[in-house]
């Protein structure tokens, strides 16, 4: 089974979150994709989405969010620029496939934005998250209004307990890899 993990990104205000979501090229290349925030107990909220049909490597900007869909590589690149403390939260990529429900992509992103300098995190043996920091880097599409109840979730538990979804086997597993910490002034 594919493992669903929650990746934790710790950044400072003003920095950029720069992540990617991969998808099955043959199935979803031109499908509309979206970036959502998941708040505890609430329906996922769509913050930005690609055009419909999605255009190849054509950046779409909605406020401080930039989406870039590389059809030929099966990758959606998501950038959130000039991060603010209030951007902290759990995010996910989904693929719209009406009339079916949105298809969730791996992995979920737990974003923690802090003011000023934040120390390098240590490796936590019991953590279900990977933690790392990213250096800063520096057209609007209409999104469907509906959100599937099936994508409503809570943040993954802080244990190794399995998390199941109705139509696929997904396990939340212990992952403690820490990636390098580049520093930019």
């Amino acid at each position: 089974a594919t493992k669903l993990t929650e990746e934790k990104y710790e950044l400072k205000e003003g920095q950029t979150l720069d992540v990617k979501c991969d998808y099955t090229l043959e199935k979803f290349a031109s499908s509309q994709k979206a970036w959502q925030i998941i708040r505890d107990g609430e329906m996922p909220k769509t913050l930005a989405c690609t055009e419909r049909p999605s255009k190849n490597s054509h950046p779409v900007q909605v406020g401080r969010i930039i989406l870039e869909d590389y059809h030929d590589h099966g990758l959606l690149r998501v950038r959130m620029v000039n991060l603010q403390v209030e951007d902290s939260g759990l995010y996910q990529c989904v693929i719209y496939q009406p009339p079916k429900e949105p298809h969730m992509l791996f992995d979920r992103i737990r974003l923690v934005v802090t003011k000023g300098f934040s120390g390098t995190p240590g490796s936590n043996e019991n953590s279900t998250q990977n933690v790392y920091k990213i250096p800063p880097t520096t057209t609007k599409a209409l999104c469907p209004l509906y959100t599937s109840p099936r994508t409503v979730t809570q943040a993954p538990p802080k244990s190794t307990a399995d998390v199941s979804t109705p139509d696929s086997e997904i396990n939340l597993t212990n992952v403690t890899d820490i990636i390098r910490v580049p520093v930019f002034n």
Epitope: T2, K20, Y70, H73, G74, F106, D107, T137, D177
Partner: antibody, heavy 122, light 107 residues
Framework: QVQLVQSGAEVKKPGASVKVSCKAS????????INWVRQATGQGLEWMGW????????GQTQKFRGRVTMTRNTSINTAYMELSSLRSEDTAVYYC???????????????WGRGTLVTVSS | DIQMTQSPSSLSASVGDRVTITCQAS??????LNWYQQKPGKAPKLLIY???NLETGVPSSFSGSGCGTDFTFTISSLQPEDIATYFC?????????FGGGTKVEIE
């Protein structure tokens, strides 16, 4: 020991296919992308594409679309790259390389296999 | 595709010399630039990522700088073991592309 171990050299005829393996050890295989890069003798480096070992999803450059297949077997921490319809200009050393974290836009290759020489000759 | 132009394609210098290699991108790559070293018959080795960050275990005699489209890789004091070909690589846009390489020799 953190390493990528590749399969041995291959000699193929034009039109045939070759499948190169890349076995990862010393780290969590499913957490980092595996990329394939090739280098013709005396030439530069050419990125072919990537594989997410967790999802199994892959992407290739336009040049190799339809000719290259990237797969993995997570039970043995091994990635594979199969190139079909071989021609003489495919003669090169093929490297697997560990990329950045699967969810991060971090495309640097910090761990490389030793390379597999594929010779295409009639 | 983003073109990466490296210069010079080869150079010869003396032990102890300061060596500089440049890499020019065909468009702004937002500091998404890495440098690799490749010794004859070996796989490439990551030296520097994101313009100026030294990979773990890489000697401080190697450094990188630049922004936008113009980047520089420097060996502050050339040593015999630095004989190799050096490549830059961008990852701001897909496909990932490499420079043509700079072969460094000792005269």
């Amino acid at each position: 020991q953190v390493q990528l171990v590749q399969s041995g050299a291959e000699v193929k005829k034009p039109g045939a296919s070759v499948k190169v393996s890349c076995k990862a050890s010393g780290y969590t295989f499913t957490r980092y992308d595996i990329n394939w890069v090739r280098q013709a003798t005396g030439q530069g480096l050419e990125w072919m594409g990537w594989l997410n070992p967790n999802s199994g999803n892959t992407g290739q450059t336009q040049k190799f679309r339809g000719r290259v297949t990237m797969t993995r077997n997570t039970s043995i921490n091994t990635a594979y790259m199969e190139l079909s319809s071989l021609r003489s200009e495919d003669t090169a050393v093929y490297y697997c390389a560990r990329g950045g974290y699967t969810s991060a836009w971090r495309w640097y290759f910090d761990l490389w296999g030793r390379g597999t020489l594929v010779t295409v000759s009639s | 595709d983003i073109q990466m132009t490296q210069s010079p394609s080869s150079l010869s210098a003396s032990v102890g010399d300061r060596v500089t290699i440049t890499c020019q991108a065909s468009q702004d790559i937002n500091n998404h630039l890495n440098w690799y070293q490749q010794k004859p018959g070996k796989a490439p080795k990551l030296l520097i990522y994101d313009v100026s960050n030294l990979e773990t275990g890489v000697p401080s005699s190697f450094s990188g700088s630049g922004c936008g489209t113009d980047f520089t890789f420097t060996i502050s004091s050339l040593q015999p073991e630095d004989i190799a070909t050096y490549f830059c690589q961008q990852y701001d846009k897909l496909p990932l592309t490499f420079g043509g390489g700079t072969k460094v020799e000792i005269e």
